[in-house]
């Protein structure tokens, strides 16, 4: 299982190794170094993968990660059972689908072993960490002489997400996008005959059942038109 | 070096309302997970409101539906809107902070945060 471990995106107040909590003084206040962000993504509603930078302990440390869900059925606290490892180090947790409840405020809780007081409790909104697969299956088709309309399937519910498409020709340097809602179709209204199209596709879940920010990777592009463009020197840049 | 400063504390009778602010200076909250926390005397902080810097925001059980949280970027200040106040508010509320780099994270575990103000006190009289 290859897994892809989140860094932090260069936010300076995160680079200290340790701090002094300032905390009020009536409080149990200890200095005590900060564990890393859990950071969670759900794909495709299949399985979920929570991680942190393991990196970023002082010296290597088997964290242990327990969950729950809040007010639900679901809140009895349980432990990871099936841990991601980085260099033999804990570095997240995989949940498989019957364990992901995407409704429910989901809690995670990071815990140093070595020193149980050393841990830090997240909450989180899967519904709001959900990205699908890619498209598949795109095909296009003509309405008219002059009008293309481009096809996708998704491997969910489709009214659940919204879609990106972009297109451009041989002779384009960038790419134009439309946003698609649910219906998971786009139609091209005037096409020329003479350059070759090139079609893609990334879908994102969001508004109507999450509020995702994260897109699915792009789809496979798809290509309509004429072959022959001998003085296009953007076709190797699609076909790569 | 962030510096947060409550205001809006008080004494205020059962089934009222108060608004608590709470001011940072030294550096924009905008990427900052932040809390509200309260300590009643005897008692173990807890947390009130917390909230993710991309907008999720979590409420503890006993006051979901009477308090709400709001930011204001602009400003670097964020509040606390307590309505219908119950003897059982009574409490010191402290304001908190924490950098994170997701914009998915919310701690309601206090020693998770780096920054807080010194308190306020808010007082709900039956």
């Known amino acids: 299982l290859n897994t892809t471990i989140l860094t932090p995106n260069g936010n300076e107040d995160t680079t200290a190794d340790f701090f002094l909590t300032t905390m009020p003084t009536d409080s149990l206040s200890v200095s005590t170094l900060p564990l890393p962000e859990v950071q969670c993504f759900v794909f495709n509603v299949e399985y979920m993968n929570c991680t942190w930078n393991s990196s970023s302990e002082p010296q290597p440390t088997n964290l242990t990660l327990h969950y729950w869900y809040k007010n639900s059925d679901n809140d009895k606290v349980q432990k990871c059972s099936h841990y991601l490892f980085s260099e033999e180090i804990t570095s997240g947790c995989q949940l498989q689908k019957k364990e992901i409840h995407l409704y429910q405020t989901f809690v995670v809780q990071l815990q140093d072993p070595r020193e149980p007081r050393r841990q830090a409790t997240q909450m989180l909104k899967l519904q709001n960490l959900v990205i699908p697969w890619a498209p598949e299956n795109l095909t296009l088709h003509k309405l008219s002489e002059s009008q293309l309309e481009l096809n996708w399937n998704n491997r969910f519910l489709n009214h659940c997400l919204e879609h990106l498409v972009q297109y451009r020709t041989d002779w384009d340097h960038s790419w134009t996008e439309q946003s698609v809602d649910y219906r998971h179709k786009f139609s091209l209204p005037s096409v020329d005959g003479q350059k070759r199209y090139t079609f893609r596709v990334r879908s994102r879940f969001n508004p109507l059942c999450g509020s995702a920010q994260h897109w699915s990777e792009w789809s496979h592009p798809i290509h309509w038109g004429s072959n022959t463009s001998k003085e296009n020197p953007f076709l190797f840049a699609l076909e790569a | 070096e962030v510096q947060l400063v409550e205001s809006g504390g008080g004494l205020v009778q059962a089934g009222g309302s108060l608004r608590l602010s709470c001011a940072a200076s030294?550096?924009?909250?905008?990427?900052?997970?932040m809390g509200w926390f309260r300590q009643a005397p005897g008692k173990e902080r807890e947390y009130v409101a917390i909230d993710s810097w991309g907008g999720d925001t979590f409420y503890a059980d006993s006051v979901e539906g009477r308090f709400t949280f709001s930011r204001d970027n602009a400003k670097n200040e964020v509040y606390l809107q307590m309505n219908s106040l119950q003897p059982e508010d009574t409490a010191v509320y402290y304001c908190?902070?924490?950098?994170?780099?997701?914009?998915?994270?919310?701690?309601?575990?206090?020693?998770?945060?780096?920054?807080w103000g010194q308190g306020t006190q808010v007082t709900v009289s039956s």
């Open positions: 030294g550096r924009t909250l905008s990427r900052y997970a």
């Open positions: 908190a902070g924490a950098p994170t780099s997701f914009a998915t994270t919310a701690y309601s575990s206090s020693n998770s945060y780096r920054y």
